[in-house]
Amino acid sequence: NKILVKQSPMLVAYDNAVNLSCKYSYNLFSREFRASLHKGLDSAVEVCVVYGNYSQQLQVYSKTGFNCDGKLGNESVTFYLQNLYVNQTDIYFCKIEVMYPPPYLDNEKSNGTIIHVKGKHLCPSPLFPGPSKP
């Protein structure tokens, strides 16, 4: 028995930040779980972890230097990534493991979300404005 995960196929981070919502076919209420976001086709980089527990507030952390936060819904976890770089454009996969109460459950691998990080193109204002039109 596996949890199904739905993600947006693609997101664009215009301001170097993005909200990625992982929607699960499972209600996380009163469960103890570990939701994570992984970067790359091989999911080699664990970008962010959200640890949910019935007795404590949500724990959110990254061991790989990403600036991330997380928000919990009944059947979803939303990862908020900030300060992304253009070279971090990649495919990102949601993962979920429900530990307590038993049985342990994890997810079928999702299709992932391509996060396209657009650099900030700030046009400097000219020193001398051109002639005004009549």
């Epitope: 103890e32 019935y54 493991e97 530990m99 109460p101 342990y104």
Partner: antibody
Framework: EVQLVESGGGLVQPGGSLRLSCAAS??????????VSWIRQAPGKGLEWIGS???????YYNPSLKSRVTISRDNSKNTLYLQLNSLRAEDTAVYYC????????????WGQGTLVTVSS | DIQLTQSPSSLSASVGDRVTITCRAS??????????LHWYQQKPGKAPKLLIY???SLESGVPSRFSGSGSGTDFTLTISSLQPEDFATYYC?????????FGQGTKVEIK
């Protein structure tokens, strides 16, 4: 036949570290459906869960020991490891590895245990 | 953490006696109709052995004189007719919440 065999116990100095091994046979540590825990028992005392590792490689620790414990595994050897740091006298115990199935987390197979004595 | 309190802590009984051990949890260990409470037997110098899982299911290979019952916070292990090999210490364990916890044990001695 499922078997778990612990090794690595012995006398350790206070403040030192221990690394115990648990060789599993009859099942794979990386196959879904089962996980393995470390559990300890101080002389004449009850049982205390230390932590678990799931087939995915995710680990879970007892909050009372979390800062000093690391559980890892080597899939190629089908072996589980327990690293415990900053040892004190109260860590003296028989250390067991035990398998659990995912449906109820009841420990259905246990190793024979290995005794760790922390003393100067 | 969920505390499990076993009673009695020890008892003396004779071969053929009916023995009952209770385990009380500090909160319910039930979830969607399942009780995450298990019983183990441990003999001196040996590892614990699973007897009963999910409150009342007999582990494979365990004699039918062992039975478990209960739900919520109150559970019972019963040995219908005590045999010489049953003199040991018995532990309950919950797996409903992390961390998994064990009762303090009940030692069954020969009268």
């Amino acid at each position: 036949e499922v078997q778990l065999v612990e090794s690595g116990g012995g006398l350790v100095q206070p403040g030192g570290s221990l690394r115990l091994s648990c060789a599993a046979s009859g099942f794979s540590l990386s196959t879904g459906g089962v996980g393995v825990s470390w559990i300890r028992q101080a002389p004449g005392k009850g049982l205390e869960w230390i932590g678990s590792i799931y087939h995915s490689g995710s680990t879970y620790y007892n909050p009372s020991l979390k800062s000093r414990v690391t559980i890892s595994r080597d899939n190629s050897k089908n072996t589980l490891y327990l690293q415990l740091n900053s040892l004190r006298a109260e860590d003296t115990a028989v250390y067991y590895c035990a398998r659990y199935e995912y449906d109820y987390y009841a420990f259905d197979y246990w190793g024979q245990g290995t005794l760790v004595t922390v003393s100067s | 953490d969920i505390q499990l309190t076993q009673s009695p802590s020890s008892l003396s009984a004779s071969v053929g006696d009916r023995v009952t051990i209770t385990c009380r949890a500090s909160q319910s260990v039930d979830f969607y109709g399942k009780s995450f409470l298990h019983w183990y037997q441990q003999k001196p110098g040996k590892a614990p052995k699973l007897l009963i899982y999910a409150a009342s299911s007999l582990e494979s290979g365990v004699p039918s004189r062992f039975s478990g019952s209960g739900s919520g916070t109150d559970f019972t292990l019963t040995i219908s007719s005590l045999q010489p090999e049953d003199f040991a210490t018995y532990y309950c364990q919950q797996s409903y919440r992390s961390p998994p916890t064990f009762g303090q044990g009940t030692k069954v001695e020969i009268k």
